[in-house]
Each structure stands twice: as structure tokens, then as C-alpha cells.
Amino acid sequence: AVNGTSQFTCFYNSRANISCVWSQDGALQDTSCQVHAWPDRRRWNQTCELLPVSQASWACNLILGAPDSQKLTTVDIVTLRVLCREGVRWRVMAIQDFKPFENLRLMAPISLQVVHVETHRCNISWEISQASHYFERHLEFEARTLSPGHTWEEAPLLTLKQKQEWICLETLTPDTQYEFQVRVKPLQGEFTTWSPWSQPLAFRTKPAALGKDT
């Protein structure tokens, strides 16, 4: 049950959550596994139970405190272990010395809203959620707009190489329904990755004025 190819990946949301995914080909779905966190300079130890998310994949969240509390810093090291029950004992399946700020994945941006919409333009703003004050302005964003008849995968990516929590979309078609998403990434960390995409924001451009050239 434990001899398949395995992978253990964790990310810190920069505040009070470490999310982990453990995958193991050939493992039994009812195998009982957990992630144990052992920090080098904190008084707490933390454990979460890995719960199935797919056929051979389990996930859990180590919740370290209140969502906006700064529980770890750039100098912290947290040893993370996957422990799986084998009969009466626990076996270490994976181990890593986790540097939180080398392994960042922020929460998806929230509070997307249309600030102003015209026939060919739309100004949209958003907020970042549970992001550490350590980043100051060292964040970047990617955005995408879903046009009628296309898929999200076909949408071109717009890159904002600075902490800019708004965008002005141009060259839009009048009286057309669009959807918009954005994601965020700190510049820090060798294994840092993009946040999930935000919830899509639906908006409609204004119709062209009758009798006017569009």
C-alpha cells in the first residue's frame, strides 16, 4: 500500500496557514495519514489529518492561528512529516525542512468589483487577502478576461509586475458580457507559486449610443 511513487508538497499562505498535498500511487484510499509540523523556534507543534481529494491524493491545512496573524517569519524552519499508520505504528513517508517564505502561495484575491464601465473599457479593482506585511509592495499579479465563445485557457494573460490592485481593460466590445479573474504571487521564494485564481467577476460593457460610430 505504500510502495508507489509519492509526492509531498506544502505552501505557506504568508500568515497562519500551511496547506499540504500528499499523493501516493497505489495507496489504499482508507490509509490513515497525517502531517506533523515541528517548528525550530516556536513552542507549538501542529498536526492535521490528510483527507482524500482524489483517487491517490490527500490534503490538509495546518491552521497556526487567527487568519490574519503573522505566525511565521523568514527565519523560521518547520520540519514537516507525512506519517501513515501501518498496523499499530506510524511510519514516516516523507520529510522536509520547510522554509515558509521559500514556499509561498497566497490566498486568491477577493472583493473584485467594477469601478467604472464604458462601451469599450472597464476599470476593475480587487484586494489581497491574508497577505503578510513583509511583502510591502513586492507582489505581482496576473489577470485574464473571458470573452464570449472562448474558454479561460484561451484567454491571454495580462501581467502586472507591481502591487497594483486595479486594471483598466480596453478594446472591449460594446454591450457584451465578460468575466474577469486575477491571481497574485510574491516575488520572494524559490518554490513560490501563483495563488489560485479569484472567483470570476461578471460584467457587461455599455451598449454603443444609437446613431454614433463605434
Epitope: 505504500v2 510502495n3 511513487t5 509519492s6 509526492q7 509531498f8 508538497t9 515541528w38 525550530d40 524552519i77 520540519t79 512529516r81 511510519r91 514516516v92 513517508m93 516523507a94 520529510i95 522536509q96 525542512d97 520547510f98 522554509k99 521559500e102 514556499n103 524559490e190 518554490f191
Partner: nanobody, 126 residues
Framework: QLQLVESGGGLVQPGGSLELSCAAS????????MSWVRQAPGKGLEWVSS????????DYADSVKGRFTISRDNAKNTLYLQMNSLKPEDTAVYYC???????????????????RGQGTQVTVSS
């Protein structure tokens, strides 16, 4: 570019000791788990020991447990293997190897290594 350079090998009598070193460069050393593997004459690669990025987790093959100690100095970008009570069957070329991430998997310690050095010869003989 990424480099791993082993040193410290040599000829030693049974029961003797050696310390192997591995100087790493071209990557952020502390972000990666590391290991030692060896290859005896005419044999395949054998895993010896692994260590996490900051040395808080270590593992050993049964054949060396209690005799060998793996350690690292991240300030010097160096991995070590202290070998005591050496036996003729420890004779091999010893290689330092990097895992592809900060994680290693104790049940399958050979998996996930992406680079290794050129090796250093250890001969245990009277």
C-alpha cells in the same frame, strides 16, 4: 552551474574512520535535501544516508546505522559523512547527491535525486 564535489576518501584499515565532504555550488544549498550513495566494485548504486535541508531529519541504511553520521553546514554549503568502525564491505566510490526538492521519502530514499557528484574512493583494507 550546479556542482557537487566530494573529497576525503582514501585507504583506511578496518575499524578506522574517515570523514567525507561534499562542496556544493550553483544552487541554494539549504533549500534541498541531500544524500550519500555508494557503488561497490561490480555492484549497483546503494543508498547510504539522507538529510533534510537544515539537518533536522536524517536517515540511514541498516548496513551503516550506528557507524555513519550525516551532517551539513549550510553556511559553508557543505555536506559531510562521518564514517566510523569501517568494514571491508564499506569499500566503494561514495557520491554526494541532491534531491530535486526539499523533500525526501524514507521508504524510497533512492527516488527523487536529480544530481550527483563525481565521487570519492573509499577503500577499507588491511
Amino acid at each position: 552551474q550546479l556542482q557537487l564535489v566530494e573529497s576525503g576518501g582514501g585507504l583506511v584499515q578496518p575499524g578506522g574512520s574517515l570523514e567525507l565532504s561534499c562542496a556544493a555550488s550553483g544552487f541554494t544549498f539549504s533549500n534541498y535535501a541531500m544524500s550519500w550513495v555508494r557503488q561497490a566494485p561490480g555492484k549497483g548504486l546503494e543508498w547510504v544516508s539522507s538529510i533534510t535541508g537544515f539537518g533536522r531529519g536524517t536517515d540511514y541504511a541498516d548496513s551503516v546505522k550506528g557507524r555513519f553520521t550525516i551532517s551539513r553546514d549550510n553556511a559553508k554549503n557543505t555536506l559531510y559523512l562521518q564514517m566510523n568502525s569501517l568494514k571491508p564491505e564499506d569499500t566503494a566510490v561514495y557520491y554526494c547527491a541532491r534531491y530535486s526538492s526539499s523533500t525526501y521519502y524514507p521508504p524510497t530514499p533512492a527516488r527523487g535525486r536529480d544530481y550527483r557528484g563525481q565521487g570519492t574512493q573509499v577503500t577499507v583494507s588491511s
